[in-house]
């Protein structure tokens, strides 16, 4: 189940039909009932659950829950009802797998058996022991028939297995040998792909959970969008923008009669689509339901624009960002195009795709020039850094998975689809294929899938985003499919606009208020910026024509 603090509703109200009412009057999704998580925070969602048949290696709690047998009587209550530590369970009960049961019913660690010290009150731990020095794993010079496991459990913390020659220490499921003798918990969650979204490590096992808005698919164990409209995939083929419903798989034309559209993006909350036309040298916007009408296509940018090949919408702060491979710049503007400024005009060779993370205040872009790379910076243009610069040639499309905090990209020269975390670590090459990645261009991620367009195959493909498997064709015979985006409310989570939270309108900025990257708790929330012909004044808010000031960017 998801975080109960996020899942719970206020008290003293009736729950929805698909919700469960806790004793404390919280409402939780019905599917969280009897999932072995205390989502109600009073255990009421885990009471009166149907009795489960527990595995042989498990202990069955009085309320039907299953826990590992070895957790019984270990001093910690793992059963929600505490029955694993009850007097009835622990008095003269059976001991754990790593324990020895004394004659009086008490338990001592198995390694204390036959250690020539009396550990059981009745001394039964030293009864029937061979008086020989201890042997170790792989000791081949021992008397034939000697069972080292009888002495001190062979030094094993858990399971000792006697072999023809020597012995072997092993561990129960969910544990691993740390030093050939001692078992420690395996942290399955260290593998970023252990779960499709949230991984929670427990003693001896782990559990996958989903973020709010998603629910676990019981068959695949992947997280799927729980509510809202069905997700759709929107792409451009230069002359049109088309849409594919990912559930119904129906296909429609959103915008016809385009000249040369390569880049597009969406703003889900307002139902607007944004696109760049390289022939008209304009950036447009329209409501999705009116986008096919040329009268309703608003022009946001139609000046100082050469080759806008990448476009991204910051849905939180209401800005658009674009790359211009002709001007060799990266720029930002308000979503109505009214205020704009150039963020980067140096050290750009062939900037192409751009993606934004408004929640953390970062943007990412690809450059397929001679020194191909993927870079990142704050949404205000500060803290520029290179994320990927080796084993990269023609990075066309990039996309962000905000939930897993990973960036995915396609390289059309190396025929690869790769991912990396937002700080540039844990790089993974998911797919390398001249067939499926013949000339990839656009890329998008949603749920457990990654989608990409391929110009040579004239198709849209999908694959599992964690391992690159399950490659399939979503649509073919598309004729030049370029940029691609997923349209769904979960792709653009809501967040506070720092510039609006400020006491002064627009953060006190005269012109543009841009979000600053959230690197630490001390990071400024935003900085002010000025048009290209002006400079930020000493107050870091107002703009001046006099070019004496040091910088066009300042922090607040």
């Amino acid at each position: 189940a998801a975080d109960p603090l996020l899942g719970g509703q206020g008290p003293a109200k009736e729950c929805e039909k698909d919700q469960f009412q806790c004793r404390n009057e919280r409402c939780i999704p019905s599917v969280w009932r009897c999932d072995e998580d205390d989502d109600c925070l009073d255990h009421s969602d885990e009471d009166d659950c149907p009795k489960k048949t527990c595995a042989d290696s498990d202990f069955t709690c009085d309320n039907g829950h299953c826990i590992h047998e070895r957790w019984k009587c270990d001093g910690e209550e793992e059963c929600p009802d505490g029955s694993d530590e009850s007097e009835a369970t622990c008095t003269l009960g059976t001991c754990h797998g790593n324990e020895f049961q004394c004659g009086d019913g008490t338990c001592v660690l198995a390694i204390k058996r036959c250690n020539q010290e009396q550990d059981c009150p009745d001394g039964s731990d030293e009864a029937g022991c061979l008086q020989v020095p201890p042997t170790f794993l792989g000791n081949r010079r021992r008397p034939r028939g000697l069972n080292e496991c009888l002495h001190n459990n062979g030094g094993c913390s858990h399971i000792c297995t006697d072999l023809k020659i020597g012995f072997e220490c092993t561990c129960p499921a969910g544990f691993q040998l740390l030093d050939q003798k001692t078992c420690g918990d395996i942290d399955e969650c260290k593998d970023p792909d252990a779960c499709s979204q949230i991984c929670v490590n427990y003693k001896g096992y782990f559990k996958c959970e989903c973020y709010p808005g998603y629910e676990m698919d019981l068959l695949t164990k992947n997280c799927k969008a729980a509510a809202g409209k069905s997700p759709s995939l929107i792409f451009t083929n230069r002359h049109e923008v088309r849409r594919i419903d990912l559930v119904k798989r129906n296909y429609s034309r959103l915008i016809p009669m385009l000249k040369n559209v390569v880049a597009l993006d969406m703003e889900v909350a307002t139902n607007r689509i944004y696109w760049c036309d390289l022939s008209y040298r304009k950036i447009y916007s329209a409501y999705m339901d009116k986008a096919s009408d040329p009268k309703e296509q608003e022009v946001l940018i139609d000046e100082q624009l050469h080759s806008p090949e990448g476009l991204a919408v910051d849905w939180v702060h209401k800005h658009i960002y674009w790359t211009d491979s002709g001007n060799k710049t990266i720029s930002v503007a308000t979503v109505d195009g009214g205020r704009r400024c150039t963020l980067f005009s140096r050290n750009l060779s062939e900037p192409r795709a751009i993606a934004v993370d408004p929640l953390q205040g970062f943007m990412y872009w690809s450059d397929w020039g001679n020194q191909a790379k993927i870079e990142k910076s704050g949404l205000n243009g500060v803290d520029r850094q290179t994320l990927v610069s080796d084993n990269i040639e023609w990075p066309n499309g990039i996309t962000l998975d905000l939930l897993s905090q990973r960036l995915y990209w396609v390289d059309s020269k190396l025929h690869q689809l790769s991912s990396i975390d937002f700080s540039g670590g844990n790089r993974k090459m998911l797919i390398s294929s001249t067939d499926f990645l013949s000339h990839p261009f656009g890329i998008a991620v949603f749920e457990d899938k990654v989608f990409w367009t391929d110009l040579e195959n004239e198709a849209i493909f999908s694959a599992n985003r964690l391992n690159g498997l399950e490659i399939s064709i979503l649509a073919e015979n598309l004729n030049n499919p370029h940029d691609i985006v997923i349209f769904h409310e979960l792709k653009q989570p809501r967040a506070a606009d720092a510039c609006k939270l400020s006491v002064q309108p627009n953060g006190g900025c005269e012109y543009l208020c841009l979000p600053a990257p959230q690197i630490s708790s001390h990071s400024p929330k935003y900085t002010c910026a000025c048009p290209d012909t002006m400079w930020l004044g000493p107050d870091m808010k107002r703009c001046y024509r006099d070019g004496n000031e040091d910088s066009k960017m300042g922090s607040t």
Partner: antibody, heavy 117, light 107 residues
């Protein structure tokens, strides 16, 4: 409702100047390129000039280049056409237009400019 | 500039009749063609865009067709309110250019 209202037309002598205005309402003025199209009496339509959304780019038909200046004031939602060195062949009804992609979407009612001595 | 040749310059039709107006572009305009109707003393109104897309509120008796350089406007079931001048316009390249117009009268 989109409304475009032209003003400033009238009788003017050849070689003199005249400025046309167009007051726009009912839409986000700064989000659309604006144009002037003219129609000489009993003749066809003729595109004259277009201005980009922020006024930074202007486009003219060859016969008016250097004589006419199209401009806009987004704060006032107003489009202008400054016409200098007027000629008799400039006599026409001038229409203020909100452009759409590849077409002339909305037209004003027009203002007549007569160039005559 | 792209030249637009419209024909015929004028025509008259009886009530209920079907009429066609042709427009020929000097080069391929890839369906970037609009038709406008101008009633006497009024400003032109958009009828059809992208060669065959009917503007909202325009009666379905109006239809557009064509591709490449040749386009036509068809008015089936001629009505008295259809009288006026019809203009074609290419939007493929700047400068956008118009045909000379076709005057349609009711017989």
């Amino acid at each position: 409702e989109v409304q475009l209202v032209e003003s400033g037309g009238g009788l003017v002598q050849p070689g003199r100047s005249m400025k046309l205005s167009c007051a726009a309402s009912g839409f986000t003025f700064s989000s659309f390129p604006m144009a002037w199209v003219r129609q000489a009496p009993t003749k066809g339509l003729e595109w004259v000039a277009t201005v980009s959304t922020r006024g930074g780019h202007t486009y003219y038909r060859d016969s008016v280049k250097g004589r006419f200046t199209i401009s806009r004031d987004n704060a006032k939602n107003t489009l202008y056409l400054q016409m200098n060195s007027l000629r008799s062949e400039d006599t026409a009804t001038y229409y203020c237009i909100r452009e759409g992609t590849s077409l002339f979407a909305y037209w004003g009612q027009g203002t007549l400019v007569t160039v005559s001595s | 500039d792209i030249q637009m040749t419209q024909s015929p310059p004028s025509l008259s039709a009886s009530l209920g009749e079907t009429v066609s107006i042709e427009c020929l572009a000097s080069e391929d305009i890839s369906n970037y063609l609009a038709w406008y109707q101008q009633k006497p003393g009024k400003s032109p109104q958009l009828l059809i865009y992208y060669a065959n897309s009917l503007e909202d509120g325009v009666p379905s008796r109006f239809s557009g067709s064509g591709s490449g350089t040749q386009y036509s406007l068809k008015i089936s079931n001629m009505q008295p309110e259809d009288e006026g001048v019809y203009h074609c316009q290419q939007g493929y390249n700047y400068p956008y250019t118009f045909g000379a117009g076709t005057k349609l009268e009711l017989k």
